[in-house]
Interface confidence: medium
């Protein structure tokens, strides 16, 4: 017989398939799409989330001026290859044999071109800034009060390292996170910024990815923090390259 | 560092129960399983089953299903096990056994507690 | 359940010499995932079992070399190199391939 662990979910990923049939009978969940087996006792990877929800059914400035080089995810939702790590393919292709080059977030970072473009490495994205204008309220809240509640979040919700966040700033009413990770930085276990933010950006809009709990409730204070727009920058260690007709247009 | 303090020494009547408590610091105690294996005098070492604090989930061995209850409390990451309906024979020292359950597991229990007597007498 | 079968029951040994520990299992300990989940453990006298090996071979931390794990499928072995007095103790090999048990355990002592 088999010790078959009940109430067989996992409890960071909705987007998965569970039963006993690990070791002993402990729970087992495998992503959506792409069938991995993954780690419920952490967040899962946005390449690995990004292939399930392809899967399944259709439904005197203090803020950061993001540099010339910051990316922005204009292209969408598409069908990512990961790695057996689920981490993205530097190349990715659709199915009509057009390729791009992205970054370890799944961004695109060069022209489009086609099965002979090369993607030599997949080039680490180390800085995130998370821009978001909330509704407005009676008043400001307190920056560092929010400051605390921000990271509090990212720490206990997401996972994420104190130290990765580098930075909240705040001039009602824009909000900016900013998360900063080099390679050097990450350490074995540690959750990737990357995926923390993207964990964040479906909590603001309301599509949970955690299994079972409430969408996320943000107050500073006991007054509720509600998020009107949000924009994602993302920096990579290399600079994207794409050709000077897109940086023109 | 991790640790594993768990509750002292108890003394029962055949037909009581038992609860031990284990609380855990120096780790995340949502993150890895807790198991619970006893010794009784002289003897070998007996899994009793294990839970994952993160949703509670649990998982018993048959001996045990019936007269065993494994919960947690995540605000103070202390783990519990109770033992209903003691008899003569379910003395022993119970430990708790943190297991490793993150990526790559090995599901090994690397930390134990140091171990409650629980003597069942009349 | 699966049955974990140790031998010996008792083994004196002399300080600097090695020791080995076999333990049987009574079905294969390979997990449909690849994996051997065998673990060995030590239970030093009045002390708490701890971890010395996990996964058949892997020495967990602050564990010494002279300790080292081997074996697949039904047969393992735990080998003490140059055994020290601070060796003593009951030796348990565990599996959680399947619904976890232990072995019946070894004790080690100094001759």
């Known amino acids: 017989h088999t010790a078959a662990q009940d109430n067989c979910t996992c409890p960071t990923n909705k987007m998965t398939v569970c039963s006993p049939d690990g070791p002993g009978g402990r729970c087992q969940c495998r992503a959506l799409g792409s069938g991995m087996a993954v780690d419920c006792s952490t967040l899962t990877s946005k390449c690995l989330l990004l292939k399930a929800r392809m899967s399944a059914p259709k439904n005197a400035r203090t803020l950061v001026r993001p540099s010339e080089h910051a990316l922005v995810d204009n292209d969408g939702l598409y069908d990512p290859d990961c790695d057996p790590e689920g981490r993205f393919k530097a190349r990715q292709c659709n199915q009509t044999s057009v390729c791009w080059c992205v970054n370890s977030v799944g961004v695109r970072r060069t022209d489009k071109g086609d099965l002979s473009l090369r993607c030599d490495e997949l080039v680490r994205t180390h800085h995130i800034l998370i821009d978001l204008r909330h509704r407005p309220t009676a008043g400001a809240f307190n920056h560092s009060d929010l400051d605390a509640e921000l990271r509090r979040l990212f720490r206990e919700r997401y996972r994420l390292h104190p130290k990765f966040v580098a930075a909240v700033h705040y001039e009602q009413p824009t909000i900016q996170i900013e998360l900063r990770q080099n390679t050097s930085q990450k350490a074995a276990g540690d959750v990737d910024i990357g995926d923390a933010a993207y964990y964040f950006e479906r909590d603001i809009k309301g599509e949970s990815l955690f299994q079972g709990r409430g969408g996320l409730d943000l107050r500073v204070r006991g007054e509720p923090l509600q998020v009107e727009r949000t924009l994602i920058y993302y920096l990579d260690e290399i600079p994207p390259k794409f050709s000077m007709k897109r940086l023109t247009a | 560092q991790v640790q594993l303090v768990q509750s002292g020494a108890e003394v029962k009547k055949p037909g009581a129960s038992v609860k031990v408590s284990c609380k855990a610091s120096g780790y995340t105690f949502t993150d890895y399983n807790m198991h619970w294996v006893r010794q009784a005098p002289g003897q070998g070492l007996e899994w009793i089953g294990y839970i994952y604090p993160y949703n509670g989930g649990t998982g018993y061995n048959q001996r045990f299903k019936s007269r065993a209850t494994m919960t947690v409390d995540k605000s103070t990451s202390t783990a519990y096990m109770e033992l209903r309906s003691l008899r003569s024979d379910d003395t022993a020292v119970y430990y708790c056994?943190?297991?490793?359950?993150?990526?790559?597991?090995?599901?090994?229990?690397?930390?134990w507690g140091q171990g409650t007597m629980v003597t069942v007498s009349s | 359940d699966i049955v974990m079968t140790q031998s010996p029951l008792s083994l004196p040994v002399t300080p600097g010499e090695p020791a080995s520990i076999s333990c049987r299992s009574s079905q294969s300990l390979v997990h449909g995932n690849g994996n051997t989940y065998l673990h060995w453990y030590l239970q030093k006298p009045g002390q708490s079992p701890q971890l010395l090996i996990y996964?058949?071979?892997n020495r967990f931390s602050g564990v010494p070399d002279r300790f080292s794990g081997s074996g697949s499928g039904t047969d393992f072995t735990l080998k003490i190199s140059r055994v020290e007095a601070e060796d003593v103790g009951v030796y348990y090999c565990?599996?959680?391939?399947?619904?976890?048990?232990f072995g019946g355990g070894t004790k080690v002592e100094i001759k």
């Open positions: 565990s599996q959680t391939t399947h619904v976890p048990t």
């Open positions: 996964k058949v071979s």
């Open positions: 056994a943190r297991e490793d359950y993150g990526s790559s597991p090995s599901y090994a229990m690397d930390y």
